[in-house]
């Protein structure tokens, strides 16, 4: 993980643990500027309530695998997801969900009802977002679940269904 | 740009490039605490799909010009916009949009349908938000576009239509 | 307040003010890594337009008291609140609000109309969020106000009504 704000160093991984003692360059480089982040766009073809993401997204200090972002550095993470939905209303209302999961357990969710009027309509667009500020250990997983994945609009809006994470405060 | 967390220094601009070598004060001051941010409220009078913003907003390490926020320091930026809409529904639905543009190109958008029932109504309020985590070079521009700017509620909610940006991780 | 990214130090309070001069460890420890954050979930039982929050939430460098988060360190704060609403629609529309208050004054608000069709419906779910990037002094208060607190869904979604704050840039 490149420490963005520490010039003149080529090491890729932060110095974990260790006692820098009075070695100030060591202290400076090893701690103040640790950064981890991800910005992933949803896969074009969804076939599961657990969303999958394009692996070519921006990712730094985390690992993506099978729909999960895997934490590499313990700390307080800000997690935010935003999804664009497209529903063709029929004569009943539809509940759209967006759930953030940590270690496969729902931690926070959004629920919005559309097509409430029961009027048949060409296209109803809706947008859901959800955030979480959560302390995560190494190897914790972050994932996203929706009930009706068929309504996630990956056609009109391929860039607009996003899971983003950044480390606010490192703890090692 | 004042580096907020570095006391006892009066220089306004961060030390860009350069080799601090073993000069620790130089290293400390030039990198760990670089901050850039903006918090702008929409102009009272809109006449364009590209929104304009009040220049008296909070702005630090970026420049505002002609509807654009212009980046001064390269790095990973968190961008978030939130708009409050007011629509008087008639007998057709209305699609409200909020688009974030980087260098005049749409990078992320929100689309929400209101007045779906076709029932005439006094006032329908709706709120859209959109975020982006994006790596930006010096002189990159950030702007916002809406399709129906006449629905952006600048009267009742002059403070509630906001474009905000902050630098998460500096790269120089 | 523990400075998360400064190892090998046990002091709990940041060095405020003071002149570190050429004492680099002092400079390093006193400033670059100051962190304050909170992540609070709404109380189960609401009886006021000013929301109250569970005191057992995550809180660091701020104090919670009587519905207010009280700032301990001056700086630029990112504040975000998200609420899940549940409305049983009858024959009239309902305006849901979410207002962020600084020192008891509305600084930013979200307003969304539901039940616009006038059609009686079992349950309509709606989700509102609001953010603010604001400079706060010591003892400033952050609170949240809603008009129709009876619609905040504390039953189905006890974990999903959240006020979160983090210090982006410290100024002392």
């Amino acid at each position: 993980q490149k420490k963005d704000s520490t010039p003149n160093t080529t090491e890729k991984a932060p110095l974990k643990g260790g006692n820098c003692s009075e070695d100030l360059f060591c202290t400076l480089k090893s701690t103040p500027s640790k950064k981890s982040w991800a910005y992933l766009q949803v896969s074009k073809h969804l076939n599961n309530t657990k969303l999958s993401w394009n692996e070519d997204g921006t990712i730094h200090g985390l690992i993506y695998q099978d729909g999960n972002l895997i934490v590499q550095f313990p700390g307080l993470y800000f997690i935010v997801c935003q999804l664009q939905f497209l529903v063709q209303c029929s004569n009943h209302s539809v509940d759209l969900t967006l759930q953030l999961l940590i270690n496969s357990k729902i931690k926070k969710q959004t629920l919005v009802t559309v097509c409430e009027s029961g009027v048949q309509s060409k296209n109803i667009y809706q947008n859901l977002s959800q955030f979480l500020l959560h302390y995560l250990q190494v190897n914790s997983t972050i994932s996203v679940r929706v009930d009706n994945f068929q309504y996630v609009d990956t056609n009109t809006f391929p860039l607009d269904n996003v899971l983003s994470v950044f480390l606010y405060s490192s703890s090692d | 740009q004042k580096k907020d967390s570095t006391p006892n220094t009066t220089e306004k601009a961060p030390l860009k490039g350069g080799n601090c070598s073993e000069d620790l004060f130089c290293t400390l001051k030039s990198t760990p605490s670089k901050k850039s941010w903006a918090y702008l409220q929409v102009s009272k009078h809109l006449n364009n799909t590209k929104l304009s913003w009040n220049e008296d907003g909070t702005i630090h390490g970026l420049i505002y010009q002609d509807g654009n926020l212009i980046v001064q320091f390269p790095g990973l930026y968190f961008i978030v916009c939130q708009l409050q809409f007011l629509v008087q529904c008639s007998n057709h639905s209305v699609d409200l949009t909020l688009q974030l543009l980087i260098n005049s190109k749409i990078k992320k958008q929100t689309l929400v349908t209101v007045c779906e029932s076709g029932v005439q109504s006094k006032n329908i309020y709706q709120n859209l938000s959109q975020f982006l985590l994006h790596y930006l070079q010096v002189n990159s521009t950030i702007s916002v576009r809406v399709d129906n700017f006449q629905y952006v509620d600048t009267n009742t909610f002059p403070l509630d239509n906001v474009l905000s940006v902050f630098l998460y991780s500096s790269s120089d | 307040q523990k400075k998360d990214s400064t190892p090998n130090t046990t002091e709990k309070a940041p060095l405020k003010g003071g002149n570190c001069s050429e004492d680099l460890f002092c400079t390093l420890k006193s400033t670059p890594s100051k962190k304050s954050w909170a992540y609070l979930q709404v109380s189960k039982h609401l009886n006021n337009t000013k929301l109250s929050w569970n005191e057992d939430g995550t809180i660091h460098g701020l104090i919670y008291q009587d519905g207010n988060l009280i700032v301990q360190f001056p700086g630029l704060y990112f504040i975000v609140c998200q609420l899940q609403f549940l409305v049983q629609c009858s024959n009239h529309s309902v305006d849901l609000t979410l207002q962020l208050l600084i020192n008891s004054k509305i600084k930013k608000q979200t307003l969304v109309t539901v039940c616009e069709s006038g059609v009686q419906s079992k349950n309509i779910y709606q989700n509102l969020s609001q953010f603010l990037l604001h400079y706060l002094q010591v003892n400033s208060t952050i609170s949240v106000r809603v008009d129709n607190f009876q619609y905040v869904d504390t039953n189905t979604f006890p974990l999903d009504n959240v006020l979160s704050v983090f210090l982006y840039s410290s100024s002392d």
Epitope: - | Y125 | L46, N47, Q88, V94, D95, Q150
Partner: antibody, heavy 120, light 107 residues
């Protein structure tokens, strides 16, 4: 048509209690908060408290805690206020009022009022 | 608690006059202010809500203005039917509070 129909005027002895009602019609009772307001003779208006039938939650003005008890019966669309340990200070007209559901709406409908006279 | 200071406490004006009643809150109340008209022996009637919004059925001669903590009610072309007591009311914060009332008489 929205209507709030209050019970009749009351003449009561000091130390006694009184329970008045406010029957709502013309709208969905559980959708709105019902508030109670006191108006002493020749005086201004004072907020006593409110009840939200949907979630059975009450809020009180500190001044009236222990004096007023608010309840609601969803089956009959009726809100109630009981005043206890009455003194001459409690002689007043008491109104129920509905707070609107749209943004910034105030008390859009009021009952006709109940005059309570406390006298021995 | 938020205090609402209403002025004047009473006033007399002639038919066709314009009158203004003021209400000062002890803190910012974010436009959560209503004006009510009350006639003798009757319930208060909502005239203005949200500081500036005219309630349905209320003549356009009535208007509300203000923001923050300072609000006013203006009645143009005063008519006989405008006689009564006018109350301001904040519903921004619990406990809800009212002004002391302004008695308006027509000469």
């Amino acid at each position: 048509e929205v209507k709030l129909q209050q019970s009749g005027d009351e003449l009561v002895r000091p130390g006694a209690s009184v329970k008045m009602s406010c029957k709502a019609s013309g709208y969905t009772f559980t959708d709105y908060a019902m508030h109670w307001v006191k108006q002493s003779p020749g005086q201004g208006l004072e907020w006593i408290g409110s009840i939200i039938p949907l979630i059975d939650t009450t809020s009180y003005n500190q001044k009236f805690k222990g004096k007023a008890t608010l309840t609601a019966d969803k089956s009959s669309n009726t809100a109630y206020m009981e005043l206890s340990r009455l003194t001459s200070e409690d002689s007043a007209v008491y109104y129920c009022a509905r707070l609107g559901s749209r943004y910034l709406e105030g008390f859009d409908y009021w009952g006709q009022g109940v005059m309570v006279t406390v006298s021995s | 608690d938020i205090q609402m200071t209403q002025s004047p406490s009473s006033m007399s004006a002639s038919l066709g006059d314009t009158v203004t009643i003021n209400c000062l809150a002890s803190q910012d109340i974010g436009n959560y202010l209503s004006w009510y008209q009350q006639k003798p022996g009757k319930s208060p009637k909502l005239m203005i809500y949200g500081a500036t919004n005219l309630e349905d059925g209320v003549p356009s001669r009535f208007s509300g203005s203000g923001s923050g903590s300072d609000y006013s009610l203006t009645i143009n072309s005063l008519g006989y039917d405008d006689e009564g007591i006018y109350h301001c009311h904040q519903y921004y914060e619990y406990p809800l509070t009212f002004g002391s009332g302004t008695k308006l008489e027509i000469k």
